[in-house]
């Protein structure tokens, strides 16, 4: 029961996390204009991984995709790649984990197969979460670097007349969504891995078999009994083949050429 709950909760947490990673990747507010030094034009610029948006003083918002923009930073491409890898791995992980769920019966799937699938999906969720966290963190680092560079070169102009007031960018909502979503996916993955341990079939139990001598000779044949798991049909230590090994009720008093005294 606890295993099913852990697995189910891990799946739900990962599902929410991956939905968050997708949302963060699609969001436009990865970097937002720092309004500390609000320019006279009263515009608000925010940028995402795929497009840049500007809300003008009239309230009109215009967004443009970066496909027209040459020379995008390699770091931005790296962040895009990390987020996409995270989404793909997470999506595959979700697909695998659906079939691995203990509460869902698919044909005659063994518990060992479900355990393996749970572990696989768990590892995928962990890697997916790490990709998202890494992607968001790389972007955040890029923002911090850009912020201090912009602060140093904020005002540029000629002949005492300020000609440009450079925009400083700060953390956008997508960064926080990404961090939280990545964390949730990671936690979900860990929960799936924990659930996997409980799903795996128990190791072979060797049941003790007692031998009592009813006469002067003990009937014993090495290898006469199969090791029992406790789940099979040989739980009552019945005779497996004729050859000297007997259960307590079947021991005969006359010696055999195979007997060891």
């Amino acid at each position: 029961m606890a295993v099913t709950a852990c697995q189910g909760l891990g799946f739900v947490v990962s599902l929410i996390g991956i939905a968050g990673i997708i949302a963060a990747t699609c969001m436009d507010q990865w970097s937002t204009q720092d309004l500390y030094n609000n320019p006279v034009t009263a515009v608000f610029n925010y940028q995402g991984l795929w497009r840049s948006c500007v809300r003008e003083s009239s309230g009109f918002t215009e967004c443009r995709g970066y496909f027209t923009l040459l020379g995008l930073p390699a770091m931005l491409q790296a962040v895009r790649a990390l987020m996409i890898v995270g989404i793909v791995l997470g999506a595959i992980g979700l697909l695998v984990s659906i079939f691995a769920l203990k509460c869902i019966r698919i044909g005659s799937m063994e518990d060992s197969a479900k355990a393996n699938m749970t572990l696989t999906s768990g590892i995928m969720f962990i890697v997916s979460g790490l990709c998202a966290i890494a992607g968001v963190s790389v972007f955040a680092n890029m923002l911090v670097t850009n912020f201090w560079m912009s602060t140093a070169n904020m005002y540029t102009g000629m002949g005492g007349m300020v000609q440009t007031v450079q925009t400083r960018y700060t953390f956008g909502a997508a960064l926080f969504v990404g961090w939280v979503a990545g964390g949730l996916t990671l936690i979900g993955g860990v929960m799936m891995c924990i659930a996997c341990r409980g799903l795996a079939p128990e190791e072979t139990n060797y049941k003790a078999v007692s031998y009592h001598a009813s006469g002067h000779s003990v009937a014993y044949k090495p290898g006469g009994f199969k090791a029992s798991t406790g789940f099979g049909s040989n739980t009552k230590n019945k005779k497996i083949y004729d050859g000297g090994a007997r259960t307590e009720d079947e021991v005969q008093s006359y010696p055999s050429k195979h007997d060891y005294v």
Epitope: T41, V43, V54, E62, L69, T167
Partner: nanobody
Framework: AVQLVDSGGGLVQAGGSLRLSCAPS????????MGWYRQAPGKQRELVAS???????TYADSVKGRFIISRDIAKNTVYLQMQSLKPEDTAVYYC??????????????WGQGTQVTVSS
């Protein structure tokens, strides 16, 4: 580096007209909130007129009905058609716009200014 280049100023008689134009030099990604400001000697800089990409225009009360701001989106150029000019319109006229030049690169850009003198 991107710059806003404004032109069209000069000396004109009262009641006359002038047309100012402003465009960015260099490669830009997008341009927003283009407008004109003016600064008379010993006075604060004030907004004359501005236009946004959706066509919304704003005018200072003192120029309403006399000045018309227009924009050529294809050329990223803004114009200020000034008619019925008065001596109090004498000032240095500055073009202003918010320009996005690239990824995490934008700013509030100003032109170098063009002198408009209205003689009575």
């Amino acid at each position: 580096a991107v710059q806003l280049v404004d032109s069209g100023g000069g000396l004109v008689q009262a009641g006359g007209s002038l047309r100012l134009s402003c465009a960015p030099s260099g490669k830009i990604f997008s341009i927003h909130n283009m407008g004109w400001y003016r600064q008379a000697p010993g006075k604060q800089r004030e907004l004359v007129a501005s236009t946004t990409n959706d066509g919304t225009t704003t005018y200072a009360d003192s120029v309403k009905g006399r000045f018309i701001i227009s924009r050529d989106i294809a050329k990223n150029t803004v114009y200020l058609q000034m008619q019925s000019l008065k001596p109090e319109d004498t000032a240095v006229y500055y073009c202003n716009a918010f320009i996005v030049t690239g990824f995490m690169a934008s700013g509030d850009y100003w032109g170098q200014g063009t002198q408009v003198t209205v003689s009575s």
